[in-house]
């Protein structure tokens, strides 16, 4: 359990930038939590570098990360989930850089899944539904979701809708007729826990109906 590297320690290493970022995932594997860290500079030579977390742990002082290619990873039940932990980059017993981080403020939810879109002919709308594993979790239950959709031909013209439920209605008249749309969704913690957006769900593709010339309404698919 060593502290910050002193000036003059590891002279060669001092030239490098060891800044890193981490995210936590709670109850990601049953009751196990995970913590993932990576260097911000992809060119850092990680050969002899290790990560260690100390403090805010249950009945242990410190835990060592496993190295998985360019990322460092812990899966454990031993997070207290309150207060700050000291996360350090180490070479042997020497700490090169350390950060104090509250793991409840760097939570990255799991990506939503089972995204689908159903057209309701009578209502002239599309019902978007998706699922999230967080509905079953003890901790990170309350999420804000970001549904993004675009016409497939519009490379970067995404429309975003934020919602707290897992169901969204898109009005047909707000969409272009006879067009192919791509839609996807991601999540972020929204109560007590703080952190980052999840990865995006796999995209779902749907086509809007043609306009029915006599009524001015779209034809169903």
């Amino acid at each position: 359990e060593s502290g910050y590297a002193q000036n003059g320690d590891l002279e060669d290493a001092e030239l490098d930038d060891y800044s890193f970022s981490c995210y936590s995932q709670l109850e990601v594997n049953g009751s196990q939590h995970s913590l993932t860290c990576a260097f911000e500079d992809p060119d850092v030579n990680i050969t002899n570098l290790e990560f260690e977390i100390c403090g805010a742990l249950v009945e242990v002082k410190c835990l060592n990360f496993r190295k998985l290619q360019e990322i460092y990873f812990i899966e454990t039940k031993k997070f207290l989930l309150i207060g700050k932990s000291n996360i350090c980059v180490k070479v042997g017993e020497k700490s090169l850089t350390c950060k104090k981080i509250d793991l409840t403020t760097i939570v990255k939810p799991e990506a939503p899944f089972d995204l689908s879109v159903v057209y309701r002919e009578g209502a002239n709308d599309f019902v978007v539904t998706f699922n999230t594993s967080h509905l079953q979790k003890k901790y990170v239950k309350v999420l804000m979701h970001d549904v993004a959709y675009r016409q497939e031909k519009d490379e970067n013209k995404w429309t975003h809708v934020n919602l707290s439920s897992t169901k969204l209605t898109l009005l047909q008249r707000k969409l272009q007729p006879a067009a192919m749309y791509e839609i996807k969704v991601r999540s972020i913690p929204d109560h007590y826990f703080k952190g980052f957006w999840s990865e995006w769900s796999p995209s779902y593709y749907f086509r809007t109906p043609e306009i029915n010339n006599s009524s001015g309404e779209m034809d169903p698919i």
């Epitope: 359990e1 989930l81 207060g83």
Partner: antibody, heavy 119, light 105 residues
Framework: QVQLVQSGAEVKKPGASVKVSCKAS????????MNWVRQAPGQGLEWMGL????????SYNQKFKGRVTLTRDTSISTAYMELSRLRSDDTAVYYC????????????WGQGTTVTVSS | EIVLTQSPATLSLSPGERATLSCSAS?????MHWYQQKPGQAPRPLIY???KLASGIPARFSGSGSGTDFTLTISSLEPEDFAVYYC????????FGGGTKVEIK
């Protein structure tokens, strides 16, 4: 102001159990750990364990594991320490102490509860 | 488990004198805290994270050190400073030292 108020003195027989309460006020109870520290007569301080009031997760000193149980009732901002199979050397003052999770020191202490174990 | 050894066990000094209290760890510690305890009272925090003054603590108290050796210094003893002082490591199992009693000479 931030305050921890503990239950009154107890006299117990060897082999019995004791449950000490610690009522918190003046802060968000679930935002800080609650630690328990004891002090035998004329002796130093000994950390027994802590509880995270938000989720009930506990961390115990191995010396007391199996004999001490920490619980909490968030609805009344109260933490509890129960020590079982009491022995005469458990005679001590028992303190609850709020844990500052940024720096992991005990920033606010209760007034202490004297537990006497005697046959 | 880390053992914290405080020395001296007793320090006999007069008001106005400088007090230097030592806390030695059996292996390296990242942060150390210090508490003051008077007879019949609960401990109160003095210094946290080696050198940061706890709320309401006068500037005559200071902390220093790293690795295995830490020091609490009281630059000029006031009558209310005569008490027992404990060091404590920041991490599980939050071990306390045995204490140093600062008494009036």
């Amino acid at each position: 102001q931030v305050q921890l108020v503990q239950s009154g003195a107890e006299v117990k027989k060897p082999g019995a159990s004791v449950k000490v309460s610690c009522k918190a006020s003046g802060y968000t109870f679930t935002g800080y750990t609650m630690n328990w520290v004891r002090q035998a007569p004329g002796q130093g301080l000994e950390w027994m364990g802590l509880i995270n009031p938000y989720n009930g997760v506990t961390s115990y000193n191995q010396k007391f594991k199996g004999r001490v149980t920490l619980t909490r009732d968030t609805s009344i901002s109260t933490a509890y320490m129960e020590l079982s199979r009491l022995r005469s050397d458990d005679t001590a003052v028992y303190y609850c102490a709020r844990g500052d999770g940024n720096y992991w020191y005990h920033d606010v202490w209760g007034q202490g509860t004297t537990v006497t174990v005697s046959s | 488990e880390i053992v914290l050894t405080q020395s001296p066990a007793t320090l006999s000094l007069s008001p106005g004198e400088r007090a230097t209290l030592s806390c030695s760890a059996s292996s390296s510690v990242t942060y150390m805290h210090w508490y003051q305890q008077k007879p019949g009272q609960a401990p109160r925090p003095l210094i946290y994270e080696i050198s940061k003054l706890a709320s309401g603590i006068p500037a005559r108290f200071s902390g220093s050190g790293s690795g295995t050796d830490f020091t609490l210094t009281i630059s000029s003893l006031e009558p209310e400073d005569f008490a027992v002082y404990y060091c404590q490591e920041w991490n599980y199992p939050y071990t306390f030292g045995g204490g140093t009693k600062v008494e009036i000479k």
